[in-house]
């Protein structure tokens, strides 16, 4: 029986050219996390494997940095980065937990309505 819950950063608004941290936290379970996958729609961004460490997809290696923790840092944001991001926790013995984050990257003119890099 899967008892765990994932809390995510939820919605994030950020300015074009800035950077942002995507984070998920798995709680309420004693299951062991064997791997965390970060995906954007159907594209794999990165994998953090408990034994093998981090692997960043080649097409994202210039703009994606591992961490902090099991999170992921996106850099040099473009408007095209707007979208849904998923953290997929593979655990034993529970199975898979998935969290969803929605990122919107704003043009400077709109971003001026809020803080410089993160605009919730």
């Amino acid at each position: 029986m899967m008892t765990g819950t994932i809390e995510t950063t939820g919605n994030i608004s950020a300015e074009k050219g800035g950077s942002i941290i995507l984070q998920c936290h798995l709680s309420s379970t004693t299951a062991q996390v064997t791997q965390v996958n970060w995906e954007q729609q159907d594209q794999l961004l990165a994998i953090c494997n408990a034994d093998l460490g981090w692997h960043i997809s080649p097409s994202f290696k210039d703009r994606v940095a591992p961490g902090p923790g099991l999170g992921l840092t996106l850099q040099s944001l473009t408007v095209n980065d707007t979208g849904e991001y998923f953290c997929i926790y593979h655990t034993y013995p529970d199975g898979t937990y998935t969290g969803r984050i929605f990122l919107e990257v704003l043009e400077s003119s709109v971003a001026e309505h809020g803080a410089r890099f993160q605009i919730p």
Partner: antibody, heavy 119, light 108 residues
């Protein structure tokens, strides 16, 4: 999993008051902008109010139709969103949805709570 | 306030048909800030298409969105029974954020 659960709707007389609540879970509530969106019976969607995060000084924004009558607020320690509605009019009758958003996109919706203003 | 006008208000289609609904704004909207929502009878709205053309997770590939300036559209290449719903466009060009009046899609 993100959950938004609205409560507090009901029947109220014109010029009366009502306080709606929304309990949020599954995401970091205190960094998220939150909104109320309403829908009159058989009608379309209308954005009502928004409150931004502490890092944005809890800035609030309102539709002209509710300005000076409705007040949006939040309690980050409890992951709660509120809408205090005063001087209610019959045209405020609607389903009220609690909605999490980015700057421009309404991405997380609650199930809604029905407010009926009638004599 | 930027007023969004959706047409038609109601449309009917048979399974397999291609359908297009439009959303016109009273003043120009950035394509990055024009979004669509689906609402089925008795349910809450769901984000369906964002930034004009990106499909939200779980949305079938038969849906597409396009447009720029003051004219935007949502197209279903081959309608299925489960697509029966009301579709709303929504924009941001400063406050207030506004929605269109909706297009109700009925399946014959």
């Amino acid at each position: 999993e993100v959950q938004l659960v609205e409560t507090g709707g009901g029947l109220v007389q014109p010029k009366g008051s009502l306080n709606l609540s929304c309990a949020a879970s599954g995401f970091t509530f205190n960094t998220n902008a939150m909104n109320w969106v309403r829908q009159a019976p058989g009608k379309g969607l209308e954005w009502v109010a928004r409150i931004r995060s502490k890092s944005n000084n809890y800035a609030t924004y309102y539709a002209d139709s509710v300005k000076d009558r409705f007040t949006i607020s939040r309690d980050d320690s409890q992951s709660m969103l509120y809408l205090q509605m005063n001087n209610l009019k019959t045209e405020d009758t609607a389903m009220y949805y609690c909605v999490g958003s980015t700057m421009t996109i309404f991405s997380y919706w609650g199930q809604g709570t029905l407010v009926t203003v009638s004599a | 306030e930027n007023v969004l006008t959706q047409s038609p208000a109601i449309m009917s289609a048979s399974p397999g048909e291609k359908v297009t609904m439009t959303c016109r704004a009273s003043s120009s909207v950035s394509s990055s800030y024009l979004h669509w929502y689906q609402q089925k009878s008795g349910a809450s709205p769901k984000l369906w298409i964002y930034t004009t053309s990106k499909l939200a997770s779980g949305v079938p590939a038969r849906f597409s969105g396009s447009g720029s300036g003051t004219s935007y559209s949502l197209t279903i290449s081959s309608v299925e029974a489960e697509d029966a719903a009301t579709y709303y466009c929504q924009q941001y060009s400063g406050y207030p954020l506004t929605f269109g009046g909706g297009t109700k899609l009925e399946i014959k």
